[in-house]
């Protein structure tokens, strides 16, 4: 679609006569008529084929015309045009005398003809003005032409539709040859297709509008290149959506159990050496001089009662020191100086001599002890308590506080390693020994049958177009990640271009 | 009176050139698109070439499409046709002429004779 | 190309006749044809041109009709200075066309 534009510029008839060589009376008022049709091979009368069009009375006799409108008439004179423009054409122009005011055709004699044209032309569409002038021995036109498209009409031939816009259906400009120029941020044939986000995954990550990177299912990050591990999964990491990959010192479907109780919670205190011995369970090799499940108790060198014969421990800083009394000395008053004629056995002790009196033994009631009978029995000194249990004196009675895992007054018991049901997906569960063991239904395996070896959701290939499919553990589900250009939960539909446009 | 003379026919040998001239005179020469128009002895009219008022717009029949050029120089109202490469073929009566029927225009040259042969 | 078929390729009449050529185009021609009258050593003569139009100074005797492929030629009554070659030429596309031709003799 375009407009064949004809600017006339002058026309000359000084003796201001017809064609027929009579006259006009009293000059020549002249109007033009103008006929653009196909390109023949001999100009021949005919329809015009490309349209018409007529001007009011421009002139009289000789006169050059205004390039703007005149007389309501336009110049240039304009002969749209709505089909591919051909390059060449046949033009007809008719200079014609007006004697009244009425100019249709029926109106005028045959012979008010002053002049006629007949050109083959040849013309590119946007050329600049072609000019041309035609001579007869009476008159001379000057006129010149072009050929421009019509708005949103692009191309050689003005055949090239292309509106410029900025919607759903397209974000681009146009260019002088009719071809889409996109605008910044926009892709593909039509500049439909967001550029997304700089380093925006290919496959993981798509865009709805430019600069913009949302992620497939299964991803995360800024770039959609972070897969999403596991729901659930604590300490543990993931190379395709929805794994588990444990990190070290952790186990279990969901990596939340604790391989590594020791480096993950350092609960030995005061310098004591972990060592891990199971699931959250681990045990403190104490450094001197302290006591307790987690050495966290800072022992005293005096509570073992070093000091014999009433002698009296102080704790020193390298130590201890025993102050003995009268009738003893020794590290640890254990030298005697006394005999039974001195009294020296407590809480009713009977004394028995030795070595012809120079010494003497102390025959203790129950519940005392102690060279002299001076001390109470500490109940806790043959180390009763099994498992590493802590012994606690309760007056005339002892108690033992156990360790994780341990039970019973002397913590000689194993608690059941199965009381919490340690195996998953209804595996069952024996105490052994060391630990337990589970045995596991069928579709599952590993030492907590956490572990799905048959039941596959993927197995089946349910997704299209060359998804990658995802197994979803915990729901017994897969996830189909589509590649681009499909959508569906099993990526079953294309997206596809709109076949054409609505403008 | 309107005249169209042909001129520059003659005798040559095949692969050789001939210039033809063709001058007007009693018309507005520039006004009009020229032909050249030949026959061939004892055959019908056949047309070789056209040229356009201005000279922009130039067709050529295929059998001579390379080898003939046809031009015109309005100053001097002479159409011309260059005639390269010639054969046998091309032996025929030349003929100029300005045709425009919606002008009523109908011009014919008597023709120059060009003979080809070795 | 388009081919121009005409006939006869030759007539034998007598001064008074009615003689009717015709030529038919390989495809529509839109009325853009000529009819011409050619004698020994004479250039050929318009007399008919966009089908029916007479060309000035023809006499009226002769006519012309068709549209789309086919056209006629008429002349309502033979004189003396008719008997001549007729061809037609169309002018609607390059490469221009002609007529084999019509030999009009005296019967």
């Known amino acids: 679609s375009g407009v064949f534009q004809l600017q006339l510029q002058e026309f000359i008839n000084e003796r201001g006569v017809l064609a027929s060589g009579r006259p006009c009376e009293p000059g020549c008022r002249t109007f033009f008529r103008v006929c653009l049709k196909h390109f023949q091979a001999v100009v021949s009368p005919g329809p015009c084929t490309f349209g018409t069009v007529s001007t009011p009375v421009l002139g009289t006799n000789s006169f050059a015309v205004r390039d703007d409108s005149s007389g309501g008439g336009r110049n240039p004179l304009q002969l749209p045009f709505n089909f591919t423009w051909p390059g060449t054409f046949s033009l007809i122009i008719e200079a014609w005398h007006a004697p009244g005011d009425d100019l249709r055709p029926e109106a005028l004699p045959p012979d008010a003809l002053i002049s006629k044209i007949a050109i083959q032309g040849s013309l590119a569409v946007g050329q600049n003005w072609l000019l041309d002038e035609q001579t007869s021995t009476l008159t001379r036109l000057r006129y010149s032409y072009r050929v421009i498209c019509s708005d949103n009409y692009y191309g050689d031939n003005c055949s090239r539709l292309c509106k410029k816009r900025n919607d759903h259906f397209g974000h681009y400009v146009c260019q002088p040859d009719g071809n889409l120029s996109c605008l910044p941020g926009w892709t593909g044939e039509y500049c439909q297709q967001p550029i997304c986000l700089s380093g925006c995954h290919e496959q993981n990550g798509y865009c709805s509008k430019p600069a913009e990177c949302l992620c497939r299912p299964g991803w995360q990050g800024r770039l959609c290149n972070e897969c999403i591990p596991h729901n659930g999964c604590r300490h543990g990491t993931c190379s395709t959506p929805w794994q588990c990959t444990c990190d070290e010192g952790w186990g279990g479907l969901f990596c939340d159990q604790d391989l590594n109780y020791c480096t993950h919670h350092s609960p030995c205190k005061n310098g004591a050496t972990c060592s891990n011995s199971g699931q959250r369970s681990y045990t403190c090799t104490c450094r001197p001089g302290y006591t307790g499940v987690d050495c966290e108790l800072e022992l005293s060198e005096c509570d073992s009662n070093p000091c014999r014969n009433g002698g009296s421990c102080k704790d020193q800083e390298d130590g201890y020191h025993c102050l003995c009394p009268p009738g003893y000395y020794g590290l640890h008053c254990e030298h005697s100086t006394l005999s039974c004629a001195d009294s020296p056995c407590f809480n009713g002790g009977s004394c028995r001599e030795r070595n012809q009196g120079a010494n003497y033994a102390c025959e203790c009631p129950p519940n005392f002890t102690g060279s002299n009978c001076e001390k109470k029995v500490d109940r806790c000194t043959s180390n009763p308590c099994a498992n590493g249990g802590q012994c606690l004196n309760r007056g005339p009675s002892r108690m033992c506080r156990c360790r994780p895992g341990f039970t019973g007054t002397y913590c000689e018991l194993h608690v059941s390693d199965c009381a919490r049901n340690p195996c998953a997906h209804g595996g069952t569960c024996h105490d052994l020994e060391n630990g337990l063991m589970c045995t596991c239904p069928a579709g599952f395996s590993g030492r907590r049958c956490e572990v799905r070896t048959s039941i596959d959701a993927c197995a089946s290939s349910p997704c299209f177009n060359r998804a990658t499919c995802y197994t979803d553990l915990s729901t017994d589900t897969f996830v189909c990640n589509c590649p681009y250009g499909f959508v569906g939960s099993r990526c079953e539909f294309p997206v596809g271009l709109p076949p054409s446009f609505p403008w | 009176e309107v005249q169209l003379v042909e001129s520059g026919g003659g005798v040559v040998q095949p692969g050789r050139s001939l210039r033809l001239s063709c001058a007007a005179s009693g018309f507005t020469f520039s006004n009009y698109g020229m032909y050249w128009i030949r026959q061939a002895p004892g055959k019908g009219l056949e047309w070789v070439a056209f040229?356009?008022?201005?000279?922009?717009?130039?067709y050529y029949r295929d059998s001579v499409k390379g080898r003939f050029t046809i031009s015109r120089d309005n100053s001097k109202s002479t159409l011309y046709l260059q005639m390269n490469s010639l054969r046998a073929e091309d032996t025929a009566v030349y003929h100029c002429?300005?045709?425009?029927?919606?002008?009523?225009?109908?011009?014919w040259g008597q023709g120059t004779m060009v003979t080809v042969s070795s | 190309d388009i081919q121009m078929t005409q006939s006869p390729s030759s007539l034998s009449a007598s001064v008074g006749d009615r003689v009717t050529i015709t030529c038919r185009a390989s495809e529509d021609i839109y009325s853009n044809l000529a009819w011409y009258q050619k004698k020994p050593g004479k250039s050929p003569k318009l007399l008919i041109y966009a089908a029916n139009r007479l060309q000035d100074g023809v006499p009226s005797r002769f006519s012309g009709s068709g549209s789309g492929t086919d056209y006629t030629l008429t002349i309502s009554s033979l004189q003396p200075e008719d008997f001549a070659t007729y061809f037609c030429?169309?002018?609607?596309?390059?490469?221009?066309?002609f007529g084999q031709g019509t030999k009009l003799e005296i019967k």
């Open positions: 002429a300005a045709l425009n029927w919606e002008l009523g225009i109908d011009y």
């Open positions: 030429l169309q002018g609607s596309k390059f490469p221009l066309t």
């Open positions: 040229i356009s008022h201005g000279g922009g717009i130039t």
